[in-house]
């Protein structure tokens, strides 16, 4: 929930707003509820329908660390376990992803650049 200060002169100094909940499906027009003391407000809001691009895919996974490099294939792998799926998304419970192994120098550079992305 996000908190928001309101300009002086209004009765409430700090409104707490809940998430925008679409009225249908996963995107489009919806409502956001706000509270301030005993007061409540309901305002129109919109969740963009390209939310997949903006907020991640239909299926979110929690990944293990990358495994060791497989010399025969030149790749390393890691497994992901389903963390959350959009209600109607038919997601695999576990997935396995691979990527090419890189030399130590490249790995170090990549690790610095891509920190927190793996």
């Amino acid at each position: 929930k996000k908190k928001e200060k309101v300009k002086k002169g209004s009765e409430c100094s700090e409104w707490t707003w809940g998430p925008c909940t679409p009225s249908s499906k996963d995107c489009g027009m919806g409502f956001r509820e706000g509270t301030c003391g005993a007061q409540t407000q309901r305002v129109h809001c919109k969740v963009p329908c390209n939310w997949k691009k903006e907020f991640g895919a239909d299926c979110k996974y929690k990944f293990e660390s990358w495994g060791a490099c497989d010399g025969s294939t030149g790749t390393k792998a890691r497994q992901g376990t389903l963390k959350k799926a959009r209600y109607n998304a038919q997601c695999q419970e576990t997935i396995r992803v691979t990527k090419p192994c890189t030399s130590k120098t490249k790995s170090k550079t990549k690790a610095k650049k891509g920190k927190g992305k793996d």
């Epitope: 249908s24 376990t81 963390k83």
Partner: antibody
Framework: QVQLQQPGAELVRPGHSVKLSCKAS????????MNWVRQRPGQGLEWIGM????????ILNQKFKDKATLTVDISSNTAYMQLSSPTSEDSAVYFC??????????WGQGTTLTVSS | DIVLTQSPATLSVTPGDSVNLSCRAS??????LHWYQQKSHESPRLLIK???QSISGIPSRFSGSGSGTDFNLSVNSVETEDFGMYFC?????????FGAGTKLELK
């Protein structure tokens, strides 16, 4: 496979809030949407709302927005639904069900809530 | 809210008969329609998801069809254990809604 355990019955006085539980065992509890459904005696099924244990995202049927509060406790693999200011109209069987679009769903046996003084 | 209308309200059949249950949505819901069976004093049991997808452990005599606003559940050669209530449910938009049900009873 997910098993959902719900108390068979709960008795509550009118106006006294009650918290119904739904304990999951088996496969990962935190990956799937947990739905709550009401069935009044001799009636059909009514969706109350759902919560995702991974981040507590909640979608509530507006009809129940002043009645039901959904929460989860990941440490005990338990989902809860609190009903505020219950009246005799809230006497019903309350089901929880864990939903996956991929594999389908699993239902608890339901809790029969009786609101009576 | 999306309204689901089920028909008929009651269906009286003899074991061995084949039957069709109908569910009509008040607006298009794509294929986001699921069928449940419920016997007295039991939890609902999912029979078909997403209009036509079968569920592990459900007998093959149950099948679903339809898209948009009109959906059907077919039971090929009804068995005595099939008697009970049948509900359709949509997951296309919030709130999720159920039909009022069709009662499948012994003639």
């Amino acid at each position: 496979q997910v098993q959902l355990q719900q108390p068979g019955a709960e008795l509550v006085r009118p106006g006294h809030s009650v918290k119904l539980s739904c304990k999951a065992s088996g496969q990962s509890f935190s990956s799937y949407w947990m739905n709550w459904v009401r069935q009044r005696p001799g009636q059909g099924l009514e969706w109350i709302g759902m919560i995702h244990p991974s981040d507590s995202e909640t979608i509530l049927n507006q009809k129940f927005k002043d009645k039901a509060t959904l929460t989860v406790d990941i440490s005990s693999n338990t989902a809860y639904m609190q009903l505020s200011s219950p009246t005799s109209e809230d006497s019903a069987v309350y089901f929880c069900s864990s939903w996956s679009a991929k594999r389908g769903d699993f239902w608890g046996q339901g809790t029969t809530l009786t609101v009576s003084s | 809210d999306i309204v689901l209308t089920q028909s008929p309200a009651t269906l009286s059949v003899t074991p061995g008969d084949s039957v069709n249950l109908s569910c009509r949505a008040s607006e298009s819901i794509s294929n986001n329609l699921h069928w449940y069976q419920q016997k007295s004093h039991e939890s609902p049991r999912l029979l078909i998801k997403y209009a036509s997808q079968s569920i592990s452990g459900i007998p093959s005599r149950f099948s679903g069809s339809g898209s948009g606003t009109d959906f059907n559940l077919s039971v090929n050669s009804v068995e005595t254990e099939d008697f009970g209530m049948y509900f359709c449910q949509q997951s296309n938009s919030w709130p999720l809604t159920f039909g009022a049900g069709t009662k499948l009873e012994l003639k």
